[in-house]
Structure formats: C-alpha cells, structure tokens
C-alpha cells in the first residue's frame, strides 16, 4: 500500500501491481525489457505531496531499483478526480534491469490517463490499466487508488474502470457510463503495395468515445468496427497505414518501424467520425506518439487479452484477439508469434 501524508493525514492511497515494458539499445541491437514493480518499492517522500493550497495538486511518486520512479499526478473538480498525468523515469545505468545498455542516462516518459473516479469514492480496476508512453508501456493491475481522501482510509464507495465491465451498483456515475455493445467481431485486414503485402492483421476493434451531448451531459459510448466496413491502406518504407471506414466514420491505424531495433508498432491512430447526438457532431482525434502492438519485424504480434490503447482523453481504442504483422510479411502468412506480456501470465 502506497500512502502520501501531510501532517499525519493521508491524502492519497494506492495499491496495485505494476510492470513497465520498454526497449533500450545495446551493442547487439535493441533489447525489450519487462520490469515488475518489486515489493521493496516505496513512496518517495520528497517527490510526493498532498498539494499546496491554491498552488498545486496532489502527487504520488513511487521509487524502486536504482532510481526508477513512477509518478501519478492528480487533479479534481467538484464531482470527480483523476490521474491527470503519469510519469515513468528509468535509469539505464541500472545493470540489473538494463544489462549492457549503451546509454547510462535517465529517461522520463509521460502520458495522460483515463484513471478517474467520483470524489469520495475509490477507483477500482481489477483488469489491466495500460498507459502508453513514447518508449514505455506501463501496466497497472488490481488497482485501488484514491486521492483527496476524507479520513485516511479508502472510502466505502467505488468507481470501477470501464474494462472491468458494469459496476456492482446499477446507478450511473457522472459522467454517464459507457454504453457498451457486445464484443466486436474479429475482422481480417490485408494491405498490399508495389512490393507485396505490408500489413496482415486479424483483430476485433472497438472505439470508446467520450463526448459532450447536446444536453451538455458527458457520455462515454463504445462503437464496434464491423467486418463490413471498407478497408484500404498504404505501404511505405517507414510507415504502414490501415484505413477502415464507413459512411459515418474513418479510422486510420499507422504502424511505424524502429529501424535500429527492427521493431514495428502501432504509432498513430486517427479518427474522424460523425456523432449525431453530440454538441459538436464532427469528432476528430489523432495521436501519433503511441507505442502499442509491438513486435520484431518479420514476426507477428499476438494478444488474446483485451487491450485498451489510450489515444486521448476522448478516445480509447479497444483491441480484442489481435494478431498483426507490419512491413515484412512473407507468403501472405503470419510469421513467428510474439505474445503480449499479459497472455503469458
């Protein structure tokens, strides 16, 4: 249990297990490392705070190993609080976790998150919370988090993460709960260029969109991508795109490649969509600094576990039963499989 206190009063409590997936350079090329938050991890007192009146918000910094830290910065309004920003700092001079690293520098990566809960209730998420940063994927599991605490203990009530499914209570939190359809159907995608197939994918996609309705209420809705949607794409040396569209929506997935490490990954998501009941019916979002669905070029990335790719505060891309291979696809068939971390557990 991680606690942040001020004058003996606890303002943040958090309990979770965490792992950090990242890549680093060695003389023999790129290495992928998956670091677990050890039992010895503790709150960094001078990096954590209950916030200063009228000046700053509460933050929790957890330190472990040789100078690695995970920081959660909180903010609130009248009815809800959230982890506005998450930072992960890692020290490549830690030979235990980064053997043979060429660089010995300290790197800090950050991302916004969709961790939010009602004031005076704890945030609860049994499922994986995946936060995608530039070169790191942070995975929190079995998380109970609460900031702006009232009496130095977790509150009775809880706000559940959307990936845990419906909350035990039937009453909706504010904003409205996601209107989740059934799981999307697996679709098969194939992008071909002048030099043959550059993308092969089998996956079920779902868009989780948060928007303001005409009545000024915030709603989160899930939209399934149908196998009937039209798919197209393009093959480039450093960029492979897959576009899936229908009359109301155009979703573009952009896969990038790190030439030095021979890794491909989902680098960008762009969505243009019409939401008839929205205050602003034209919904456009893009993020080109993702690092998801990552595997070695020539191999395929596979994950049976549902993945939530946080694109922005307004959009999360949920991927089910995915197998994808980009840039180098031989004989129109998937290559060797690289399974996601969570399938291995």
């Amino acid at each position: 249990l991680f606690e942040v206190k001020n004058n003996g009063t606890t303002c943040i409590m958090a309990s979770f297990s965490a792992s950090f997936l990242t890549t680093y350079e060695t003389a023999n090329g790129s290495q992928i490392v998956n670091i677990s938050l050890p039992a010895s991890a503790e709150v960094l007192k001078n990096g954590s705070s209950c916030g200063k009146e009228n000046v700053s918000d509460p933050s929790l910094t957890i330190t472990f190993g040789r100078g690695h830290t995970l920081t959660l910065n909180f903010t609130r309004n009248a009815t809800r609080y959230s982890v506005q920003h998450m930072y992960f700092t890692y020290n490549l001079s830690d030979t235990e976790h980064f053997p043979n690293a060429i660089s010995k520098e300290i790197y800090t990566m950050d991302s916004t998150t969709d961790i939010r809960a009602d004031i005076d209730k704890k945030y609860r998420c049994v499922s994986d919370i995946r936060v995608y940063m530039k070169n790191v994927t942070v995975v929190l599991r079995d998380a109970t988090i609460q900031a702006y605490l009232s009496n130095s203990s977790f509150s009775r009530g809880e706000t559940h993460c959307t990936q845990d499914g419906p909350s035990p209570t039937t009453g909706p939190p504010s904003p409205s709960p996601p209107l989740v359809p059934t799981n999307p159907t697996v679709s098969k995608y194939n992008v071909t260029g002048n030099n043959g197939t550059c993308l092969l994918a089998s996956m079920a996609l779902q868009l989780n969109i948060t928007y303001l309705k005409k009545d000024n209420k915030t709603v989160t809705r899930a939209f399934n991508i149908s196998p009937n949607d039209t798919s197209s794409g393009s093959c480039g040396i450093n960029l492979v795109t897959l576009k899936v569209e229908n009359k109301n929506r155009a979703l573009e997935l952009q896969f990038g490649m790190n030439a030095s490490s021979s890794l491909f990954f989902l680098q960008g998501v762009r969505l243009n969509m019409t939401l008839p009941d929205a205050l602003v019916p034209t919904f456009s979002i893009s993020n080109h600094s993702l690092k998801a669905l990552q595997a070695t070029v020539g191999n395929s990335y596979k994950c049976n576990t549902e993945e939530h790719i946080f694109v922005s505060k307004m959009l999360s891309l949920n991927v089910f039963s995915v197998q994808v291979q980009a840039f180098k696809v031989d004989s129109d068939r998937f290559g060797s499989v690289e399974e996601c971390v969570q399938d291995g557990n």
């Epitope: 009815t79 005076d120 009232s150 209570t169 909706p172």
Partner: antibody, heavy 118, light 106 residues
Amino acid sequence: QVQLQQSGAELVKPGASVKMSCKASGYIFTNYNIHWVKKSPGQGLEWIGAIYPGNGDAPYSQKFKDKATLTADKSSSTTYMQLSRLTSEDSAVYYCVRANWDVAFAYWGQGTLVSVSA
Amino acid sequence: DIQMTQSPPSLSASLGGKVTITCKASQDIDRYMAWYQDKPGKGPRLLIHDTSTLQPGIPSRFSGSGSGRDYSFSISNLEPEDIATYYCLQYDNLWTFGGGTKLEIK
C-alpha cells in the same frame, strides 16, 4: 471550527438580479465544495448547485442551471451565488453548505432571506 | 438528475410512539443517503449519513436503513422536540433532496 457566514437579507424587485455571499473560515477553503440549498415553504429543501473553489468547477441541478451562477474568490475564501430574472417563486431562504467529505451536508450557513416583491 | 420520492408528505403521531418515513431513489444510490431535521427559523440539521450512521450527539431514537433504491428513517419514543420537517438527501450522484415529511404530534 468550520464557519460559514452569509450576507444579509435582500428585498428585490421582479426581473432583477441578486448576488449573495458566503465567507468560509476554520478550514482550507480550496479543499471542499461549497453547496447552495434553497428552502421555501412550497418546495422544501432543494439543492441548487455546488462549486469547487480550487478551480471554479460548478455543477448545477437541472432546475437551477439557468437561474443561479456560482463563483468563488480564493483570496477572500468567499463563495457567491447570483440569481437572475427573479420572480416571486424565488422568494426563499438560501443556505450555503459545506459537505464533510462523504458525510453529506454537515455545516450550514445561517441563511440569506431573499424576498421578491414589486 | 436522480429523483427522490419521499412519503408520506405529512404524518401525525402520538408522543412515545414511532414513525417511519421512506424515500425511493430513481436509481441505485449505493447507500449514499442522509436524513435531515428542519425546524422553522433554524438551519437544517444532519441526523444520519451513509444510510444508518448517526451523527455525533443525535439520540439513538433516530435510525435509518435501506439499500439500492429504497430507504427508510424511523423515530421511536417520539418527543415534543421532534416536531419538524424531515428530508432525505442522496449524494451518490450529484445531490438531491426528497420532498419532505412534516411531522406533527397528535
């Protein structure tokens, strides 16, 4: 100890606006929401809205969102409620209230009586 | 907004007797229910929060129970000072008062 001191009674004409204040003391002003509640003989107690002084975020009851405007001044630890386009229906006692976290509305101001009359 | 339906609007009971007031929410409020006593010329007074937890200094003659959408509030051994209007308040999702129950002594 927590104290909420409200401004004095107001006699106003129909169609006019009124702005009342609520000065908080005895706690860190930006840590808690301040709520406003209407008490009238016909309707009983009604929640109007709340304001989080830390950033001015203010959710309103559907019934009052076009009637009331809540603001807060951090420097003086004071919250304000302005009521517009007043009618006789708005004649009531208005309370500012502080919740004790999840212990509902624990601290009440002494109330401001608003009388709307031509 | 969540709607709260409080009943009865008024009731009359004898000293030493017992009364029960009910509140029904338009959706599950997860036991985030409070009860208030309101007397003329005074500010409302919090009696019970979290459905059944008595505020410090409130006599045990007052009690509350319920879950989901249905909640009740009781006063036993009625005393003259209990003459007041009683309100329920949900604070699970924003805040909503019930319509009130005016208690009179026969």
